[in-house]
Amino acid sequence: CEEPPTFEAMELIGKPKPYYEIGERVDYKCKKGYFYIPPLATHTICDRNHTWLPVSDDACYRETCPYIRDPLNGQAVPANGTYEFGYQMHFICNEGYYLIGEEILYCELKGSVAIWSGKPPICEKVLCTPPPKIKNGKHTFSEVEVFEYLDAVTYSCDPAPGPDPFSLIGESTIYCGDNSVWSRAAPECKVVKCRFPVVENGKQISGFGKKFYYKATVMFECDKGFYLDGSDTIVCDSNSTWDPPVPKCLKVLPPSSTKPPALSHSVSTSSTTKSPASSASGPRPTYKPPVSNYPGYPKPEEGILDSLD
């Protein structure tokens, strides 16, 4: 027979030879880190077919690391379900607890003994320090010094000293989350007031209000003969600007003829009295007026804007 077979868990006793005679026996022993459990044979014989009789290393078992119990308020999860050396132990904590120590331990061979690579971790209760204080506002449970997992606080704004109230920008409620970190940044309290939205040749149709504070929503429509350039719905955002910007009402142009009509600031002639109502100023040469970009205010329009109510 040629050289005897090799195995992961056991090794040949003595030096291998290039050739073996029929009937010759070779013996194996369990490798370092493995131990023998009878009764399976750990030898083989060269038979008359010039092949080795079947043998396996199933009798050699990996050394195992000591049993690790679940940490309090957590779990020890053996990778591949085994404690044998070369494998890992994963540690996870129950919800509301966090890990102190190594998340993974390795079963390692020290000499012929399998031992864990470190000390098992522990699971500590998630605790948060008090949430941030905010200017012009406060939160519930302000007297509490330590918060547990999922404890929530709700912010509210103080009464404003002036005529306009403070608006709460952001989520009012935050909770103590994983890693002892609050679920999100604290909101802020500030006066948010958008300017009165003026739309020339149009008007507001909903969302009427004395003043327009944070998240106020307004809708517009244009007068007959005008069309909406922009969104018909705008919302007062946290920067005290309308988002999207206040729309414009532009004059519906007549069907185009061969020669386009000249833009003019003169009064259009018709049976009903119409007069220009654009943001252009004064009797000037025909031109496109400069467009202002102040948020929340009507901008100059092209051409004559008839004032039709």
């Epitope: 020339e200 004395k210 109502a277």
Partner: antibody, heavy 118, light 107 residues
Framework: EVQLVESGGGLVQPGGSLRLSCAAS????????ISWIRQSPSRGLEWLGV???????NYNSAFMSRFTISRDDSKNTAYLQMNSLKTEDTAVYYC????????????WGQGTLVTVSS | AIQLTQSPSSLSASVGDRVTITCRAS??????LNWYLQKPGQSPQLLIY???SLHSGVPDRFSGSGSGTDFTLKISRVEAEDVGVYYC?????????FGQGTKVEIK
Amino acid sequence: EVQLVESGGGLVQPGGSLRLSCAASGGSVSSYDISWIRQSPSRGLEWLGVIWTDGGTNYNSAFMSRFTISRDDSKNTAYLQMNSLKTEDTAVYYCERVYDGYPWFAYWGQGTLVTVSS
Amino acid sequence: AIQLTQSPSSLSASVGDRVTITCRASQGIANYLNWYLQKPGQSPQLLIYYTSSLHSGVPDRFSGSGSGTDFTLKISRVEAEDVGVYYCQQYIKLPWTFGQGTKVEIK
């Protein structure tokens, strides 16, 4: 608190022109939206137009072809340029600070009288 | 333009009387209506904005109500200093317009 003072009124012939000034003290004219309003016994109170903080303007269409509102930030003054004046333009003219971006007129000056007569 | 019609055009009241002035709009203006008082020889002064909100410094004997097209200014107990011309003003739509005025005199 900003104070607005109108000036430039007087007697002018029909067809003539006049420029009224609105000087701001105690604040910057460019920080406020300024409206011009006039008052006459025959026509009552009439809103003429507004110049917004960004320099954009809106007008009462009845006056737009003849009246122009402007502003000179270096002089801290707003203006109402009136052309092709008619006898019915005789009135007291007020410049008015629009109340905090809302069309409420809470800051009336004393006004300036414009008389259009031959 | 939106027309505002005030009634009555004038009225005479005794000190302590309750006075009511109405303002009717030619089309709906929601609550976008202000009231002004022009005392003799003075410029107008803002009394009420957004139909019913009292401007700072205005006595609480003044009150406003209404919505849409019909609005009312009430003086619960008129005083001698309340004489003058009262104006309403709309601001839902350009051009912003005023009523023709209601003159209040004291008997």
